[in-house]
């Protein structure tokens, strides 16, 4: 057992059928000795007496709140949340496996830039007795400051006859350069709890790894004389780390029509322009990755050809 | 500690082409060495990331954008004293910060040439014969050396009497190819941003 | 199985035209750029030019602009070069070569050669 | 118009060792440039396109890297049936422009 916060623990139990369970005691947060009795949850049946209360927690009926008493007085508080190990592995029954870009991925992260600013998001089924905790830092035996926010839902959507929560928290390195070269990656905890359910996830990865600019700006067309050539031009997005000599982008430029499986004219290119073919009812879209370190690719950004 | 402004024209900065090829070979050797070593902790998630120029040049800081020397936390105390003529420089008006930087990568270079030359001469010996150093890296390293055209003394290759263990070298290679392709990516933007001002 | 078949070899004087065919099979026919290349004896690989059989859209190397054109019949899924004002030193083999996206080929015609002699 | 330069025009490899072929641009061309593998009396055939991608159908072997001006086709160990011509494209402007070819001869 371990305090996840102040009068919250977490009773760690290996979950097979029959299992013994945990032997856990609890002591009442008061200077009182005599007269205090316990109860859990709503119920008012006095499970024991005493400044303390052994329990054998096998079961989520053995969790919950446990509050000591003394003449109708509370007087005080112990959450035990149960966090379930079967065969060897902790359980992730609360949030969903993205499977990307492996299988057993729970919590993905993406940065804009090099600045030290990052946002992970992560998928439930769950919609209700639902809360997240996060914290961050750079290693882990020496951990170096980084401060997320509070973890807020960012997107329902309909998965079939499933609702689908997203999650999803910002986090910012505290003392952050763009030009460092990292050695030690940025861990991310999740602490998931649903009503008595405790669990945790993690991810660790460089800022480099998760790059994902955004979309380049400002696309413009302008058509050649005498030709079905079009020039496309665009600027790197706001968001880009500066300066852009040494923060370079290369982009892919790509003319297609509305279906993937139709026709298309595609090239890379360094510079901020390129020239391609138009074609009716086809759109010109544009995507940009950082040009030294190959990590994603940004969204499209689009405009139509006509 | 910083990048000026003023310096050589983009025409004028042979550099740049030789770093672009740098980058790529080692990402190729990289790429090769995580196929042909795939029972071996190899990605860069398995591998302890150790940095063999620590505390002995400080390229990033002396390659540093003026536009970052804003930011307090690009700003490290680590002095380093370099040797400051190079053919990189290409203009008289070339400011010693910018002598120190591209110094700073000349000693990267040699530091890293000297440890892959000795660990392929231990991957030569290995019976497997399963991975060795692509030659067109080495040659790239070379090249991108003698464009900076710097005169410092010789480190002389490591040599070691005892019989190699084949499974640490490899993993050692894979240790330094990581760090040597992070080294790599920050000089494509020096030369990037040098050959731009 | 996407297949290009090409007509025959020709033979031709200097100063006339040459008409190349290039049939297609497997797939639909305008879902592709169709592009023409051609190689002397013994040289290497020159670009002449594409159609979008979908809009009959076209673009020519401007070597060969003015005496190239090509054309296509979506009916027939039928692609046409033709060359005119003959020059010995057009002799070489056309290929016909298709790929959804513009800029390079995946499929190619087994070759026409053309040889044009006094 | 962009000058594709390749070398060397020929290439004599023993069955079994690696071959790498090097094609260069006269600017800039970021990764648009493809390589194709060409037969005596035979059309073009596909082999690595945008510099690096693999197509389906064609053995692992066969490998493309480089970017900018600088391109490498790179063959891991030479089969009997490799034995042709390889000629790379480039793709990043008009005209569409080809290499002289590189022919890989039996040493």
């Known amino acids: 057992i371990w305090e996840l916060k102040k009068d919250v623990y977490v009773v760690e139990l290996d979950w097979y059928p029959d299992a013994p369970g945990e032997m856990v005691v609890l002591t009442c947060d008061t200077p009182e000795e005599d007269g205090i009795t316990w109860t859990l949850d709503q119920s008012s049946e006095v499970l024991g007496s005493g400044k303390t209360l052994t329990i054998q927690v096998k079961e989520f009926g053995d969790a919950g709140q446990y509050t000591c008493h003394k003449g109708g007085e509370v007087l005080s508080h112990s959450l035990l949340l149960l966090h379930k190990k079967e065969d060897g592995i902790w359980s992730t029954d609360i949030l969903k496996d993205q499977k990307e870009p492996k299988n057993k991925t729970f919590l993905r992260c993406e940065a804009k830039n090099y600045s030290g600013r990052f946002t992970c998001w992560w998928l439930t089924t769950i919609s209700t007795d639902l809360t997240f905790s996060v914290k961050s830092s750079r290693g882990s035996s020496d951990p170096q400051g980084v401060t997320c926010g509070a973890a807020t839902l960012s997107a329902e959507r309909v998965r079939g006859d499933n609702k689908e929560y997203e999650y999803s928290v910002e986090c910012q390195e505290d003392s952050a350069c763009p030009a460092a070269e990292e050695s030690l990656p940025i861990e991310v905890m999740v602490d998931a709890v649903h009503k008595l359910k405790y669990e945790n996830y993690t991810s660790s990865f460089f800022i480099r790894d998760i790059i994902k600019p955004d979309p380049p700006k400002n696309l413009q067309l302008k058509p050649l004389k005498n030709s079905r050539q079009v020039e496309v031009s665009w600027e790197y997005p706001d968001t880009w780390s500066t300066p852009h000599s040494y923060f370079s982008l290369t982009f892919c430029v790509q003319v297609q029509g509305k279906s993937k499986r139709e026709k298309k004219d595609r090239v890379f290119t360094d510079k901020t322009s390129a020239t391609v073919i138009c074609r009716k009812n086809a759109s010109i879209s544009v995507r940009a990755q950082d040009r030294y370190y190959s990590s994603s690719w940004s969204e499209w950004a689009s405009v139509p050809c006509s | 500690r910083n990048l000026p402004v003023a310096t050589p024209d983009p025409g004028m900065f042979p550099c740049l082409h030789h770093s672009q090829n740098l980058l790529r070979a080692v990402s190729n050797m990289l790429q090769k060495a995580r196929q042909t070593l795939e029972f071996y902790p190899c990605t860069s998630e398995e591998i302890d990331h150790e940095d063999i120029t620590k505390d002995k040049t400080s390229t990033v800081e002396a390659c540093l954008p003026l536009e970052l020397t804003k930011n307090e936390s690009c700003l490290n105390s680590r002095e380093t004293s370099f040797i400051t003529n190079g053919s990189c420089l290409a203009s008289r008006k070339t400011s010693f910060m910018m002598a120190l930087c591209l110094s700073s990568i000349y000693e990267d270079l040699k530091m890293y040439q000297v440890e892959f030359k000795t660990m392929n001469a231990k991957l030569l010996m290995d019976p497997k014969r399963q991975i060795f150093l692509d030659q067109n890296m080495l040659a790239v390293i070379d090249e991108l050396m003698q464009a900076l055209n710097f005169n410092s003394e010789t480190v002389p290759q490591k040599s070691s009497l005892e019989e190699p263990d084949f499974y640490k070298t490899k993993i050692k290679l894979c240790i330094l190819l990581h760090a040597f392709r992070i080294r790599a990516v920050t000089i494509d933007r020096v030369m990037s941003y040098l050959n731009a001002s | 199985q996407v297949q290009l078949v090409q007509s025959g070899a020709e033979v031709k004087k200097p100063g006339s035209s040459v008409k190349v065919s290039c049939k297609a099979s497997g797939g639909t026919f305008s879902d592709y750029y169709l592009h023409w290349v051609r190689q002397a004896p013994g040289q290497g690989l020159e670009w002449m030019g594409w159609i979008d059989p979908e809009n009959g859209d076209t673009e020519y190397a401007p070597k060969f602009q003015g005496r190239v054109t090509i054309t296509a019949d979506e009916s027939t899924s039928t692609a046409y070069m033709e060359l005119s004002s003959l020059r010995s030193e057009d002799t070489a083999v056309y290929y016909c070569?298709?790929?959804?996206?513009?800029?390079?080929?995946?499929?190619w015609g087994q070759g026409t050669l053309v040889t044009v002699s006094s | 118009d962009i000058v594709m330069t390749q070398s060397p025009l020929s290439l004599p490899v023993t069955p079994g060792e690696p071959a790498s072929i090097s094609c260069r641009a006269s600017q800039s061309i970021s990764i648009n440039l493809h390589w194709y593998q060409q037969k005596p009396g035979q059309a073009p055939r596909l082999l690595i396109y945008?510099?690096?991608q693999s197509i389906s159908g064609v053995p692992s072997r066969f490998s493309g890297s480089g970017s900018g001006t600088d391109f490498t086709l790179t063959i891991s160990s030479l089969q009997p049936e490799d034995f042709a011509t390889y000629m790379c494209?480039?793709?990043?402007?008009?005209?569409?422009?080809f290499g002289q070819g590189t022919k890989v001869e039996i040493k």
């Open positions: 945008f510099a690096s």
């Open positions: 070569a298709r790929n959804k996206e513009l800029r390079y080929f995946d499929v």
């Open positions: 494209q480039q793709s990043n402007s008009f005209p569409l422009t």
